[in-house]
Interface confidence: low
């Protein structure tokens, strides 16, 4: 999708419907691209992203990607079309109202990704065991 700092028209004339025929509004998502983060070892965290973007296309959903390697931790927040893979992964949870992090296999780093379809839902990313058992030691997170 188009980052919010790029001047690009939002096409509100495009009508996109869900399976029930209901009209989908272009979504509001946090959209800070990749930022360094202190999000580690907590149950959930806020994105600390001050940019709320209106997604370019009505079908796009909110996405958050948390990555940790030997050097740093980053959090990426974007809009993305769930029909297309992101970081080579399918957005399996795009219909979820909450951004529930799931671990993905990436060599050399710890990689979690979530997607969701309620306004600004990628502002609060959730690693909690009640939602995700793939990494019970990872607890939710607050950005400083």
């Amino acid at each position: 999708t188009i980052p919010p700092h790029v001047q690009k028209s939002v096409n509100n004339d495009m009508i996109v419907t869900d399976n029930n025929g209901a009209v989908k509004f272009p979504q509001l998502c946090k959209f800070c691209d990749v930022r360094f983060s202190t999000c580690d070892n907590q149950k959930s965290c806020m994105s600390n992203c001050s940019i709320t973007s209106i997604c370019e296309k009505p079908q796009e959903v909110c996405v958050a990607v948390w990555r940790k390697n030997d050097e740093n931790i980053t959090l990426e927040t974007v809009c993305h079309d769930p029909k297309l893979p992101y970081h080579d992964f399918i957005l399996e949870d795009a219909a979820s109202p909450k951004c529930i992090m799931k671990e993905k296999k990436k060599p050399g780093e710890t990689f979690f990704m979530c997607s969701c379809s309620s306004d600004e839902c990628n502002d609060n990313i959730i690693f909690s065991e009640e939602y995700n058992t793939s990494n019970p030691d990872l607890l939710l997170v607050i950005f400083q």
Partner: antibody, heavy 116, light 107 residues
């Protein structure tokens, strides 16, 4: 946090003019369609008009009661929406809200009173 | 312009009651219908969009249904903070139009 803050309301005589402003922050204002909605004292909500994005021509639409008297403009560099109201009538007395095109976010409203 | 008619215009209910508000459009609007809640002196708050989609952060006791010309907002178990005025609004065509409102009061 998304914020919409209206200003410029006040008392004006019939036939007079007033310009309302709406300062936007916390979202990509340039990508947003913006609307004005008003509410007369003790009455329901009435859509006033909208402006589309500058990139799509900044086209405006208006409700019949204000067409030809009101204009909407935007300054994307200042993240500000404007409502210019001319030839005001007593029936234009209302709280005026700016909204992120009838979405989740609305301002707190500003009161316009048209009276002699 | 499309006319939106709400009923009832007001109702009295008690905490815990199930409350239903209806909205009828003068012509078919598919599912292009939103519901707002407004409290005195405050801006409207979006509850339901696209007839049945719950806005983020809105309690699940609120639900919307309908398509075409007839729509319903249901509050499954009325809470003290739900006493307010509710408006339907169509976004099918310009100008967007609102219903006249339904005031939910304490019995």
């Amino acid at each position: 946090q998304v914020q919409l803050v209206e200003s410029g309301g006040g008392l004006v005589e019939p036939g007079g003019s007033l310009r309302l402003s709406c300062a936007a922050s916390g979202f990509t204002f340039a990508n947003a369609w913006m609307s004005w909605v008003r509410q007369a004292p003790g009455k329901g909500l009435e859509w006033v008009g909208r402006i589309k994005t500058t990139y799509s021509g900044g086209a405006t639409d208006f409700a019949a009661p204000v067409k030809g008297r009101f204009t909407i403009s935007r300054d994307d560099s200042k993240n500000t929406l404007y409502l210019q109201m001319n030839s005001l009538k007593t029936e234009d007395t209302a709280v005026y809200y700016c909204t992120l095109d009838l979405r989740k976010y609305w301002g707190q409203g500003t009161l316009v009173t048209v009276s002699s | 312009d499309i006319q939106m008619t709400q009923s009832p215009s007001s109702l009295s209910a008690s905490v815990g009651d199930r409350v239903t508000i209806t909205c009828r459009a003068s012509q078919s609007i598919s599912s292009y219908l939103n519901w707002y809640q407004q409290k005195p002196g405050k801006a409207p708050k979006l509850l339901i969009y696209a007839a049945s989609s719950l806005q983020s952060g809105v309690p699940s006791r609120f639900s919307g249904s309908g398509s075409g010309t007839d729509f319903t907002l249901t509050i499954s178990s009325l809470q003290p903070e739900d006493f307010a005025t509710y408006y339907c609004q169509q976004s099918y065509s310009t100008p967007p139009t609102f219903g006249q409102g339904t005031k939910v009061e304490i019995k």
